[in-house]
Amino acid sequence: KESCDVQLYIKRQSYHSIFAGDPFKLECPVKYCAHRPQVTWCKLNGTTCVKLEGRHTSWKQEKNLSFFILHFEPVLPSDNGSYRCSANFLSAIIESHSTTLYVTDVKSASERPSKDEMASRLWLLYS
């Protein structure tokens, strides 16, 4: 029998390489049974996760999973950093793993970085 606990399926130590000026949707995959939980996004500032207020969010429904989406319209350089979603479920808070947005500011780059440049930058981000 499947558990009816809420699960937030953000992969541990996942990341997204994105460009400033582009639109981007950050998805939090949510598994629940009867009642859809209240889900919020926050951005990590050191060890504190600061709740994101007044941002454009939406839900997307797929067969076995729902997605709580944080919209970046467009991505700004200041959106660089780590994000986490959390759900209120039976008066408990379930937190996801954090996922990191690595934002390249195209204004400061003469061209989009190569695979090797991106790899070395991401290496610094995770080391």
Epitope: Y9, R12, W123
Partner: antibody, heavy 120, light 112 residues
């Protein structure tokens, strides 16, 4: 039942490239990570890197950054490891490994391995 | 990179006797989420490795309870309470906290 079926043994010439495949059954690769691990004859295990098949994002051990390229196709539930500029040092068995279940994502199921022999 | 040091290199044990393998990491393996991503693997002769233990001490399904994992921070131990013939092979520890992921050098368990 979870299974990782790897492609057959390869005999390749120095300087050439080779692509190995790993086809998953019993789970969707997009829901986890796929790791690749190298084992030289009579030696230990070396982590090459990982791919997130959901978005194609990769992480490599710096030692393999210029040697290996990881890709994945969700449609066929298959991951690939390409090795380039092969030398005798690349003669080894290469394993694909499932990156584990939510929430821990630590390697659990292993493929049977693909033997690569580099020889002229 | 995090260096994983396993001792001993080889362990020769009589069937029915206990065995203990040590794995020390050069950095703390406690992750920011409060979990310690240390696993133990066994590679039997001619086979792929198989996971025995994850998160330091959690036993995989189907793994006999004569195997126990313990430790924290940088010091970890795999113990077999009573060695059986099917336990022979090479044991590896692996850390999944830091990039790049790294393995210990392996400990060969031989049956006396």
């Amino acid at each position: 039942e979870v299974q990782l079926q790897q492609s057959g043994a390869e005999l390749v010439k120095p300087g050439a490239s080779v692509e190995l495949s790993c086809t998953a059954s019993g789970f969707n690769i997009k829901d986890t990570y796929i790791y690749w691990v190298k084992q030289r004859p009579e030696q230990g295990l070396q982590w090459i890197g990982r791919i997130d098949p959901a978005n194609g994002h990769t992480k490599y051990d710096p030692r393999f950054q210029d040697k290996a390229t990881l890709t994945a196709e969700i449609s066929s539930n298959t991951a690939h490891l390409q090795l380039n500029s092969l030398t005798s040092e690349d003669t080894a068995v290469y394993f694909c490994v499932r990156g584990g279940d939510h929430p821990y994502y630590v390697m659990d199921w292993w493929g049977q391995g693909t033997s690569v022999t580099v020889s002229s | 990179a995090v260096v994983m040091t396993q001792t001993p290199l080889t362990l020769s044990v009589t069937i029915g006797q206990p065995a203990s393998i040590s794995c020390k990491s050069s950095q703390n393996l406690l992750d920011s989420d409060g979990k310690t991503y240390l696993i133990w693997l066994l590679q039997r002769p001619g086979q792929s490795p198989m996971r025995l233990i994850y998160l330091v001490s959690k036993l995989d399904s189907g793994v006999p309870d004569r195997f126990t994992g313990s430790g924290s921070g940088t010091d970890f131990t795999l113990k077999i309470s009573r060695v059986e013939a099917e336990d022979l092979g090479i044991y590896y520890c692996w850390q999944g906290t830091h990039f790049p992921r790294t393995f210990g050098g392996g400990t060969k368990l031989e049956i006396k």
